[in-house]
Amino acid sequence: LQDLCSNCPAGTFCDNNRSQICSPCPPNSFSSAGGQRTCDICRQCKGVFKTRKECSSTSNAECDCISGYHCLGAECSMCEQDCKQGQELTKKGCKDCCFGTFNDQKRGICRPWTNCSLDGKSVLVNGTKERDVVCGPSPADLSPGASSATPPAPAREPGHSPQ
């Protein structure tokens, strides 16, 4: 005996109470595949969430965070407050990055400046709360004997005054 339910398209469900008739999904529900015996409730976007994509009879709603907040977790399961560049979110709110660290985004944590000397390079541009240092050629490359058409300006490590 053929299962009549397999004929029910997406956006409907197989209504066993009505001799396996394909009934449309009720409001605020959907079925994304055919042959479903029930429709799923739509995802609800409320509070700190806003609707990115409305629920339809064949596809679920998708949520985003309201302005000033960003998504965390799978499928934007949580919203977290934005901070400014140069800050990180702590339990006490947005706090400026400590000296020697930076954050170039509105989310995430402050990260240490790159240590140019570890790669045998020197600091070309100092770091700030919002930006990492820019590493330049190694000090050896800047020695008088080194060939260079336009030698770069002498660089200094952050926090050090010129020699």
């Epitope: 029930t38 799923d40 409730i41 739509c42 995802r43 609800q44 409320k46 509070g47 700190v48 969430f49 679920n60 309201i66 000033g68 907040y69 965390l72 977790g73 799978a74 499928e75 934007c76 399961s77 949580m78 919203c79 977290e80 407050q81 006490k92 709110g93």
Partner: antibody, heavy 116, light 107 residues
Framework: QVQLVQSGAEVKKPGASVKVSCKAS????????INWVRQATGQGLEWMGW????????GYAQKFQGRVTMTRNTSISTAYMELSSLRSEDTAVYYC?????????WGQGTLVTVSS | DIQMTQSPSSLSASVGDRVTITCRAS??????LNWYQQKPGKAPKLLIY???SLQSGVPSRFSGSGSGTDFTLTISSLQPEDFATYYC?????????FGPGTKVDIK
């Protein structure tokens, strides 16, 4: 830091109403919905409803429809939950919680005892 | 409404044990599943959100997995402070619903 501080314990007679407050601090009160959850002694957590502090919009669990009212005063960053026609089975600890998706911060709870 | 079930309802374990608690939703809730820990006389505390994301400040011995309807909370090595009741909750759609809880006590 984020804090939700609730009002103190209440003892009420059957048929009376109770109004529990939840004062928020350490974040923008109007950005996140406040939810109310209750827990009878030795029982699990029971969701009662939500309130949007920005719009005042609410949504209540079917079980409490017609008996619960959730309101707010944005000028003092405080949410309220009022439950009317109290009966002995409403004896429970009532919690407010901030909704960021999950409930990431909770009040300390308010014990409401309904007894004649 | 979406119903949440949990198993087991209680379990006895020893410090250092690996503990697994399961939670099932009556319909697909994608990843909108959260886990809470509650100790007697205290408010619940968020451990895991989005099925598998560890809440800030929660020890890494706690982990969550699953998607759709079946979810798991795992404590890799049970510590004395982990004896408590654990609840799952769906934040997919209102009415938000909790599982009945799993009490973890000392063997």
């Amino acid at each position: 830091q984020v804090q939700l501080v609730q009002s103190g314990a209440e003892v009420k007679k059957p048929g009376a109403s109770v109004k529990v407050s939840c004062k928020a601090s350490g974040y923008t009160f109007t950005s996140y919905d406040i939810n109310w959850v209750r827990q009878a002694t030795g029982q699990g957590l029971e969701w009662m409803g939500w309130m949007n502090p920005n719009s005042g919009n609410t949504g209540y669990a079917q079980k409490f429809q017609g008996r619960v009212t959730m309101t707010r005063n944005t000028s003092i960053s405080t949410a309220y939950m009022e439950l009317s026609s109290l009966r002995s089975e409403d004896t429970a600890v009532y919690y407010c919680a901030r909704e960021t998706g999950p409930f990431d911060y909770w009040g300390q709870g308010t014990l409401v005892t309904v007894s004649s | 409404d979406i119903q949440m079930t949990q198993s087991p309802s209680s379990l006895s374990a020893s410090v250092g044990d690996r503990v697994t608690i399961t939670c099932r939703a009556s319909q697909r809730i994608n990843n909108y599943l959260n886990w809470y820990q509650q100790k007697p006389g205290k408010a619940p505390k968020l451990l895991i959100y989005g099925a598998s994301s560890l809440q800030s400040g929660v020890p890494s011995r706690f982990s969550g997995s699953g998607s759709g309807t079946d979810f798991t909370l795992t404590i890799s090595s049970l510590q004395p402070e982990d004896f408590a009741t654990y609840y799952c909750q769906q934040s997919y759609s209102t009415p938000f619903t909790f599982g009945p809880g799993t009490k973890v006590d000392i063997k």
